[in-house]
């Protein structure tokens, strides 16, 4: 931000009424009125260029310093080219000297050169040849000097002429302030610029109304430089929840809008399924029947629990059931749907029912399922099962009602045995099998059916109570089709798949395990 200038003295603006002191009196500097660019102007002039040594002083009135520490002196002046005078005016100069003196009181007309300290020799960048103001050929020079630190109540400036032809059109003395500033939603007060060039005054800012320093953020600070410019901003303020930045202020969110936290973002429109918010809202309340999960951002629409899964089917395969369903027709507006499967079994004889989670096996954990199918195995034969599939989302926990669908299935058969070839020879095959332990108690015997591959007319049957059998009197180097089926009191269980096992050829000897 540009420095603010506080003017202490302005000769040009005073209309020739300042009455500065000249020394020697009546000689040297003169107050002149002239016309420049069709405007009357006042100036102090001196032009004793043909008269030998000159020592003409012009002293300002006493200037009250006030709060200034460093003053800036801006001079606008013109100097006539010495060579444009008759004979080059041999004693002519093209510079003058600028002095100052500090004092606690006004000395009036008591002028003492010795009290003055030289600031600088002032030289023009351009000299004027034609010196007629009305002809508009005057070359105006602008020079600025600064002095500080000042400590007394006031000061004088003085101009010493040593034989130049000079017109002083403007003398402006001012000090600089860093202006009152709003930046980063922080207010920085008007601050007097320091007097030492390397130093920067640190100034603390205060957050504007309804703005706060963000958590973990730095308090707003700026530095006021000597030239009255603010530099090096540190930290910032942000509009608090319910307010947004409008130019350099925080304005309450309009009705129907909200802002959840202190941030740089603007107020957002209330999302779907929310009630119209009042002015300055930090969030928007959900419509009846809609909810917001704890982890949901305030910008997210309010949602509700899903409807029940769609089209639940249960397909029995022996002692297994495959459950399939389609997602709910109404997701509740969320994508975080998961499914939970529960199981209930009922004994047909007694009609008694109970949970069956402990006795069945799921192809994956039955709670928090994201897929829409699961296989349940280790079911007991001749048992009625009811499966419940519940759909849940992030807000289901906020309501007591549940969204589920059920499917029932009766298991009439045992699960097909899993068959393995344990060993073989040229004339025998050793076969074993297994079924889930919960079903083993219901099995009375196992029936092994086998026949030569390609011979569909004849087959052999062996029954056993155990889990293995050796089939003898087989032909060498021949493939046999083998199937095992459990027999229960209620009838036959599910048969295993048909396996192809081959006896060894006569060249291969011994009973080799496969």
């Amino acid at each position: 931000a540009q420095g603010k200038e506080v003017v202490l003295l302005d000769f040009a603006a005073a209309g020739g009424e300042l009455g500065w002191l000249t020394h020697p009196y009546g000689k040297g500097w003169d107050l002149m009125q002239n016309i420049m660019n069709d405007m009357p102007i006042y100036m102090y002039s001196v032009c004793n260029v043909m008269s030998g040594d000159q020592d003409n002083w012009l002293r300002t009135n006493w200037v009250y310093r006030g709060e200034a520490e460093r003053i800036f002196i801006e001079l606008k002046f013109t100097v006539r080219d010495c060579n444009s005078f008759p004979g080059g005016a041999s004693s002519c100069k093209e510079t003058f000297n600028l002095y100052y003196a500090e004092s606690d009181l006004d000395y009036g007309t008591n002028f003492q050169k010795r009290l003055f300290t030289k600031i600088d020799t002032i030289a023009p960048d351009e000299i004027t040849v034609s010196s007629d103001f009305e002809a508009r050929h005057v070359k105006l020079n602008v020079e600025e000097r600064s002095v500080g630190p000042l400590t007394r109540k006031g000061f004088y400036l003085a101009f010493q002429d040593i034989g130049a032809c000079v017109a002083l059109l403007s003398v402006r003395v001012y000090y600089k302030k860093c202006p009152e500033l709003l930046q980063g939603l922080a207010h920085f007060p008007e601050t007097i610029a320091g007097s030492d060039a390397p130093s920067l005054a640190t100034v603390a800012g205060t957050c504007v109304d309804h703005a706060v320093v963000p958590p973990g953020g730095e308090e707003p600070r700026m530095h006021c430089a000597v030239d009255g410019e603010w530099l090096v901003p540190i930290g910032q303020c942000l509009c608090q929840a319910g307010y947004e930045k409008v130019e350099d202020a925080c304005q309450a969110c309009s009705p129907g809008f909200f802002k959840f936290e202190a941030s740089e973002s603007p107020c957002l429109e209330c999302p779907e399924h929310t009630l119209p918010s009042p002015e300055g809202a930090t969030s928007c309340e959900c419509e009846e029947g809609f909810f917001r999960a704890p982890q949901d951002p305030a910008s997210m629409p309010c949602t509700r629990p899903p409807s029940a899964p769609h089209y639940l089917t249960a397909v029995g395969m022996g002692a297994k059931v495959e459950l399939r369903w389609t997602p709910p027709q109404d997701s509740g507006g969320r994508e975080d749907i998961v499914y939970s499967v529960t199981c209930e079994q009922c004994w047909p004889e007694s009609g008694e029912c109970g949970p069956c989670e402990a006795s069945v096996r799921y192809s994956e954990p039955p709670h928090g399922l994201t897929r829409t199918s699961v296989t349940v195995s280790d079911l007991e034969p001749h048992m009625n099962y009811t499966f419940t599939v519940e759909a849940r989302n992030g807000v289901s926990g906020l309501v007591t009602s549940r969204s589920f669908r059920t499917a029932s299935v009766s298991i009439n058969q045992t699960e097909p045995p899993k068959v393995r070839l344990e060993g073989r020879s040229t004339t025998s095959l050793s076969v074993s099998w297994s079924i889930p332990p919960p079903q083993q108690s219901r099995v009375w015997k196992y029936e092994v059916t086998y026949r030569k591959k390609g011979d569909s007319n004849s087959y052999n049957v062996r029954r056993t109570e155990g889990f293995s059998v050796t089939l003898d009197d087989l032909a060498p180097d021949t493939t046999y089709l083998v199937q095992v089926q459990a027999l229960t009191q209620e009838g036959q269980g599910a048969g295993s798949k048909v396996h192809e096992f081959q006896t060894l050829s006569p060249e291969g000897s011994g009973n080799l395990a496969v």
């Epitope: 000689k27 003169d30 002149m32 009125q33 002239n34 100036m43 002039s45 032009c47 004793n48 260029v49 043909m50 008269s51 030998g52 040594d53 013109t78 006539r80 444009s84 005078f85 008759p86 004979g87 080059g88 005016a89 041999s90 004693s91 010196s131 007629d132 103001f133 009305e134 002809a135 032809c165 000079v166 017109a167």
Partner: antibody
Framework: EVQLQQSGPELVKPGASMKISCRAS????????MNWVRQSHGKNLEWIGL????????SYNLKFKGKATLTVDKSSSTAYMELLSLTSEDSAVYYC???????????WGQGTLVTVSA | DIVLTQSPASLAVSLGQRATISCRAS??????????IYWYQQKPGQPPRLLIY???NLESGIPARFSGSGSRTDFTLTINPVEADDVATYYC?????????FGGGTKLEIK
């Protein structure tokens, strides 16, 4: 009191040269420029040139360049003007003049009458 | 060169009356508010004597009957009232530019 004392009248022949002197007193000789002015026919005043006694630097009216030569002798506080190749047109009263405080011809010598005649 | 034109060339005024002499410059002789115009009085057999410096300032020792005015290119010397001792030739002169030049003179006589 500032005083400028010029040499006496001269009668010279055409084509000759002559030198007029002007002795200064009552001020610092080297502090002020010395001018020379000619007055012809008892009326017209013309500036011839000036010399800075401090450094001997001089400046001439173009009309008199080659006609007048200005010199000084600081030790005697005297300024000189030599007039060259005189003609009857150069007959006039010649004044030495010191600048005043404000660019005026403030202090005049009494004048030297030069008559050029065969 | 700046040409200074004086008028009238001669002037006869009754004792006690006002005499006004004009001097017109071919270009401005002003610098920074100062008019580099000077007025001289010359009596026969004497060198010119400075009356007015910088157009309007009375030289020390000159009677207040003499006054000067004007700026830029038009200047006036006024003698009021005229006395017998004022019979002389009056010259204007400029020092604003090189070379300094003089007006042609105005001869003042008593009616």
């Amino acid at each position: 009191e500032v005083q400028l004392q010029q040499s006496g009248p001269e009668l010279v022949k055409p084509g000759a040269s002559m030198k007029i002197s002007c002795r200064a007193s009552g001020y610092s000789f080297t502090g002020y420029t010395m001018n020379w002015v000619r007055q012809s026919h008892g009326k017209n005043l013309e500036w011839i040139g000036l010399i800075n006694p401090h450094n001997g630097g001089s400046s001439y009216n173009l009309k008199f360049k080659g006609k007048a030569t200005l010199t000084v002798d600081k030790s005697s506080s005297t300024a000189y003007m030599e007039l060259l190749s005189l003609t009857s047109e150069d007959s006039a009263v010649y004044y030495c003049v010191r600048w005043g405080d404000y660019g005026s011809f403030a202090y005049w010598g009494q004048g030297t009458l030069v008559t050029v005649s065969a | 060169d700046i040409v200074l034109t004086q008028s009238p060339a001669s002037l006869a005024v009754s004792l006690g009356q006002r005499a006004t002499i004009s001097c017109r410059a071919s270009e401005s002789v002003d610098t920074f508010g100062y008019s580099f115009i000077y007025w001289y009085q010359q009596k026969p057999g004497q060198p010119p004597r400075l009356l007015i410096y910088r157009a309007s300032n009375l030289e020390s020792g000159i009677p207040a009957r003499f006054s000067g005015s004007g700026s830029r290119t038009d200047f006036t010397l006024t003698i009021n009232p005229v006395e017998a001792d004022d019979v002389a030739t009056y010259y204007c002169q400029q020092s604003n530019e090189d070379p300094p030049t003089f007006g042609g003179g105005t001869k003042l006589e008593i009616k």
